[in-house]
Amino acid sequence: APVRSLNCTLRDSQQKSLVMSGPYELKALHLQGQDMEQQVVFSMSFVQGEESNDKIPVALGLKEKNLYLSCVLKDDKPTLQLESVDPKNYPKKKMEKRFVFNKIEINNKLEFESAQFPNWYISTSQAENMPVFLGGTKGGQDITDFTMQFVSS
């Protein structure tokens, strides 16, 4: 069976939107009005992995782009990157480990934990216009909570 996907946008708990910053990076900033069209639309795919009521394994692709968020070691540190893939082969039910995030729902907020690096989360900075990154702390200065807005296909 083909992998089930939905289109969505994400905003952090401070209502910052995610936009492209160069070809392989996302940044978070406040957008209003027509600028909202800049925000990236994700194709969230529901993939194979350990699942529970509040934890669902997903892959986050950029809609109509052959780019996926992935988590790899760079200089011995878990790092978030945008990775290009062959569009003929993705998305797929069995995604490579580095592409998988555990979507965790807590109090109507979402966290995205790396399946490859437990306790590392997609994060944004308090400051405006900073890169989206993989952070190893929750509940500190950096933001790990998001809301999801559905986008029609």
Partner: antibody, heavy 120, light 107 residues
């Protein structure tokens, strides 16, 4: 010191089954990011990735083998298993287990291999 | 699946020679490539990972380079213990696939 020791190889008739073991020491299969894969090598041929199991139990297989081969583990024994069913002559090979951390993979440590012969 | 093609399949060289082995992928594999050395009757040994990073304990005469779909393993000055078979492995996409191997023999 990391050690991987395979066992369970031997001769089997076509259609038979065999379970290989890979006993690991010097590291824990449960350590975050840890993976153990199986790689085989037919006599005089190259290397072929068979499948893999991650620290969290997540498995991946070579699609050409998946329906017949299953990887499992026993964390209390720090051992990984390769269950091979419906064996064919072309499964005759040395089977190695190998350790890696994280994806993308590179296999840092290898066992010495165990030989499987499928013949009538 | 991604097909990895090594060239040459066999290579004859002498001690002290500079040797280059090439591995081509059927599609872009980023830098997700590793190299292994195998001697007869033995398990493979990791030489290089992430295309160019030398595994600990591997002599510095071994080096790796490349990106995208074309990669090379270079041995700057061949030593007697380097005569063996060399394999590349791509980790970009499941199933992970090896090159068919390059056998390095004494000229």
């Amino acid at each position: 010191e990391v050690q991987l020791v395979e066992s369970g190889g031997g001769s089997v008739q076509p259609g038979g089954s065999l379970r290989l073991s890979c006993a690991a020491s010097g590291f824990s299969l449960s350590t975050s990011g840890m993976g153990v894969g199986w790689v085989r090598q037919a006599p005089g041929k190259g290397l072929e990735w068979v499948g893999h199991i991650w620290w969290d139990g997540d498995e991946s297989y070579n699609p050409s083998l998946k329906s017949r081969f299953t990887i499992s583990r026993d964390t209390s024994k720090n051992t990984v298993y390769l269950q091979m069913n419906s064996l064919r002559a072309e499964d005759t090979a040395s089977y190695f287990c190998a350790r890696n951390r994280y994806d993308p993979p590179w296999f840092v440590d290898w066992g010495q291999g165990t030989t499987v012969t499928v013949s009538s | 699946e991604i097909v990895m093609t090594q060239s040459p399949s066999t290579l004859s060289a002498s001690v002290g020679d500079r040797v280059i082995i090439t591995c081509r992928a059927s599609q872009d594999i980023s830098n997700y490539l590793s190299w292994y050395q195998q001697k007869p009757g033995k398990a493979p040994k990791l030489l290089i990972y992430y295309t160019s990073k030398l595994h600990s304990g591997v002599p510095s005469r071994f080096s790796g380079s490349g990106s995208g779909a074309e990669f090379t393993l270079t041995i700057s000055s061949l030593q007697p213990e380097d005569f063996a078979t060399y394999f590349c492995l791509q980790g970009k996409m499941l199933p992970w696939t090896f090159g068919q191997g390059t056998k390095l023999t004494v000229k």
